[in-house]
């Protein structure tokens, strides 16, 4: 059984204000069940930037259809970027369990910074 | 406008139990954590309890075992059951939202707890 | 658990100047660093976070510096609705979230 590896190929991702930046992210094995939930920040005061599950996103939407069986890709688009956004952006794999899902793996972090912008 | 009410305190003999509750508005409540933080009659600031956006809890450990820390999103609520109450304890209770670098951005204007014979 | 102490415990400043406190962690927190000011009777405020960043709506006179264990807030022109109480807190090794005992600004 392969051991799940989080995936998130960008270290720096350089985004405009007012336009769209897009969060990769990948799973390389289907296992364990359960979610997997974007942050920005560590620790106990991380914040919860989507839950496919539930809650109000209403800037983010996913660049795959999460709800295909077989899906791998958990990436997102954060639309209207402001300078509030900057911050290092993670995906973490849950373990599906009773009561609680269990965090199981977490991805290494894009830092999500503003560049310049276009002329 | 953010905003954190927070309601519950009172005057309680030492061993009775209490709970407080914290009302949020003005933001997602369930995307941050949310913490209590006390501070006693002429003293600092006591970091409490606090809570992640995914329900683990953490205490320091002058309240571990008798105070419990626990949300209901759907109400947009924090709250705070407070056991075993000791004279120690007497503060004021302060809710705070925390942003993702651990600080604390927003807080409400307390509810003073007293615990006397 | 990071101890932070700081000093002096009573600043006395005449409106106008410049008033300069600092807080010494137990153990370096790099640049995880915040500051927050307290009026009597009210509600702690974030003033600073990483040691440097000012919070949304802080005025620029407000400025904090240094790294490791070591940390200053100054106030380039103190206001008469700067006299409060300041206290700082770590932000990088949690549980618990510590602070410090708090430097009080008073009129001179």
């Known amino acids: 059984e392969e051991e799940l590896q989080m995936i998130q190929p960008e270290k720096l991702l350089l985004v405009t204000v007012g336009k769209t930046a897009t969060l990769h992210c990948t799973v390389t094995s289907l296992l364990p069940v359960g979610p997997v939930l974007w942050f920005r920040g560590v620790g106990p005061g991380r914040e919860l930037i989507y839950n496919q599950k539930e809650g109000h996103f209403p800037r983010v939407t996913t660049v795959s259809d999460l709800t295909k069986r077989n899906n791998m890709d958990f990436s997102i688009r954060i639309s209207s970027i402001t300078p509030a956004d900057v911050g290092t952006y993670y995906c973490v794999k849950f373990r599906k369990g009773s009561p609680e899902n269990v965090e199981f793996k977490s991805g290494p972090g894009t830092e999500m910074a503003l560049g310049a912008k276009p002329s | 406008d953010v905003q954190l009410v927070e309601s519950g305190g009172g005057l309680v003999r030492p061993g009775e139990s209490l709970r407080l509750s914290c009302a949020a508005s003005?933001?997602?409540?369930?995307?941050?954590?949310v913490t209590w933080v006390r501070q006693a009659p002429g003293e600092g600031l006591e970091w409490v309890s606090l809570i992640s956006v995914t329900g683990t809890t953490y205490y320091a450990d002058s309240v571990k075992g008798r105070f419990t820390i626990s949300r209901d999103n759907s109400k947009s609520t924090l709250y705070l059951q407070m056991n075993g109450l000791r004279a120690e304890d007497t503060a004021v209770y302060y809710c705070?939202?925390?942003?993702?670098?651990?600080?604390?951005?927003?807080w409400g204007l307390g509810t003073l707890v007293t615990v006397s014979s | 658990e990071i101890v932070l102490t700081q000093s002096p415990g009573t600043l006395s400043v005449s409106p106008g100047e410049r008033a300069t406190f600092s807080c010494r962690a137990s153990q370096t927190v790099g640049s995880k660093l915040a500051w927050y000011q307290q009026k009597p009777g009210q509600a702690p405020r974030l003033l600073i976070y990483d040691a440097n960043t000012r919070a949304t709506g802080i005025p620029a006179r407000f400025s904090g510096s240094g790294s490791g264990t070591e940390f200053t807030l100054t106030i380039s022109s103190l206001q008469s609705e700067d006299f409060a109480v300041y206290y700082c807190?770590?932000?990088?090794?949690?549980?618990?979230?510590?602070f410090g005992g708090g430097t009080k600004v008073e009129i001179k």
């Open positions: 807190q770590q932000h990088t090794d949690w549980p618990p979230y510590t």
């Open positions: 705070a939202k925390v942003t993702w670098k651990n600080v604390f951005d927003y």
């Open positions: 003005g933001f997602t409540f369930t995307n941050y954590a």
